[in-house]
Interface confidence: low
């Protein structure tokens, strides 16, 4: 699995989407977990409804919510009030018994809110070719891991 980057702005919401084959994963609950260290376990953050047929209902754990479009095959995770400590590696998982298949590896990147770092002069707006280190900075943008990186969150 390649890693997909989702960028969000500190203090705002970030929506992470994980597409999957709806037939292959029919009847399976889904989960969102945080990778603890490079070789460590993936710690469950939130999972979809216990009843698969109710997976469309939003479930929440703190500032993280999850909902599953089982027909369309898209798992959506929303991180509210994004904070720097939310940055790190995560996984979308499909659960079957005690096993979990990885649907997508995700790197969440938290950008400083430009308004919190405004210069005395005019607010600088990036040009069209601007990048986060060359990547367009938008809310909730996702891409392959081409620019920018955040190491695994500290485990201590």
């Amino acid at each position: 699995h390649n890693t997909t980057v989702f960028q969000g702005v500190e203090g705002q919401s970030l929506q992470v989407s994980c597409p999957y084959d709806s037939m292959k994963h029919w009847g399976r609950r889904k989960a969102w977990c945080r990778q603890l260290g490079e070789k460590g376990p993936c710690q469950r953050v939130v999972s979809t409804h216990n009843l698969w047929l109710l997976s469309f209902l939003r479930r929440r754990n703190g500032s993280t919510a999850i909902t599953d479009d089982t027909l369309g095959g898209t798992l959506t995770i929303t991180l509210r009030n994004l904070q720097p400590h939310d940055a790190g590696f995560y996984q979308c998982q499909s659960l079957h018994g005690s096993e979990a298949d990885t649907l997508r590896k995700v790197l969440v990147e938290v950008l400083a809110d430009p308004l919190d770092h405004r210069d005395a002069g005019d607010l600088w707006v990036p040009g069209e070719s601007e990048s986060f280190e060359d990547a367009h900075v938008e809310h909730s943008i996702s891409r392959s891991l081409l620019e920018g990186e955040i190491p695994f969150p500290p485990t201590s």
């Epitope: 490079e38 950008l111 707006v125 986060f132 280190e133 900075v137 891991l145 990186e149 190491p151």
Partner: antibody, heavy 123, light 112 residues
Framework: QVQLVQSGAEVKKPGASVKVSCKAS????????MNWVRQAPGQRLEWIGR????????NYAGKFQGRVTITADTSASTAYMELSSLRSEDTAVYYC????????????????WGQGTLVTVSS | DVVMTQSPDSLAVSLGERATINCRSS???????????LHWYQQKPGQSPKLLIY???NRFSGVPDRFSGSGSGTDFTLKISRVEAEDVGVYYC?????????FGQGTKLEIK
């Protein structure tokens, strides 16, 4: 402590290819970008490209696009830079350098460098 | 690409004196996240470059406090308050706000 150890000097003929390796230790190799930078005799440092070992994703400077391939073997914590269709102007010391990025906005600077690999292109 | 231009190309300073190196970029190095990714590297004869200053003014670990960086936008300065013999070498400014990363042509520091 962080260490980057590069392969030895190479002498190549024009038109040939060269592959330089960079073995990393002392940090989580797969979660920091690795850059390649070269320095021709008496010239400024020149950025070639970089790789994110955890995903295999790469960026290259336009000047080298199509002629350079940067790869990484996470199991061996080693990055590679292969340059093809060599010409005399490619004679330079080639460096690998880790790009530090601990948190958003933290650094994006090359904090540790390999010892350099001299590549000489001569007929 | 962002072009980095340093001045002077070389300078000779007496031990204990102050050295100032300037760096100008062809476009603003302020990133859309408001940070400025301008760094300074030192390369001693026969050695690999070493990171001195990152993000304009932050000294890298182990770098003596006689080294300081300043500037904003497109104009930046590296100062060595009291030059020591071990400071001899070439100093490069570099930007990582935009890919491709680019370096200045270098400033050679010598002792008078």
């Amino acid at each position: 402590q962080v260490q980057l150890v590069q392969s030895g000097a190479e002498v190549k003929k024009p038109g040939a290819s060269v592959k330089v390796s960079c073995k990393a230790s002392g940090y989580a190799f797969s979660s920091q970008w690795m850059n390649w930078v070269r320095q021709a005799p008496g010239q400024r440092l020149e950025w070639i490209g970089r790789i994110y070992p955890g995903g295999g994703d790469t960026n290259y400077a336009g000047k080298f696009q199509g002629r350079v391939t940067i790869t990484a073997d996470t199991s061996a914590s080693t990055a590679y830079m292969e340059l093809s269709s060599l010409r005399s102007e490619d004679t330079a010391v080639y460096y690998c350098a880790r790009l530090l990025r601990n948190q958003p906005g933290e650094s994006y600077a090359m904090d540790y460098w390999g010892q350099g690999t001299l590549v000489t292109v001569s007929s | 690409d962002v072009v980095m231009t340093q001045s002077p190309d070389s300078l000779a300073v007496s031990l204990g004196e102050r050295a100032t190196i300037n760096c100008r970029s062809s476009q603003s190095l302020v990133h859309s996240n408001r940070y400025t990714y301008l760094h300074w590297y030192q390369q001693k004869p026969g050695q690999s470059p070493k990171l001195l200053i990152y993000k304009v003014s932050n000294r890298f670990s182990g770098v003596p406090d006689r080294f300081s960086g300043s500037g904003s936008g497109t104009d930046f300065t590296l100062k060595i308050s009291r030059v020591e013999a071990e400071d001899v070498g070439v100093y490069y400014c570099s930007q990582s706000t935009r890919v491709p990363y680019t370096f200045g042509q270098g400033t050679k520091l010598e002792i008078k």
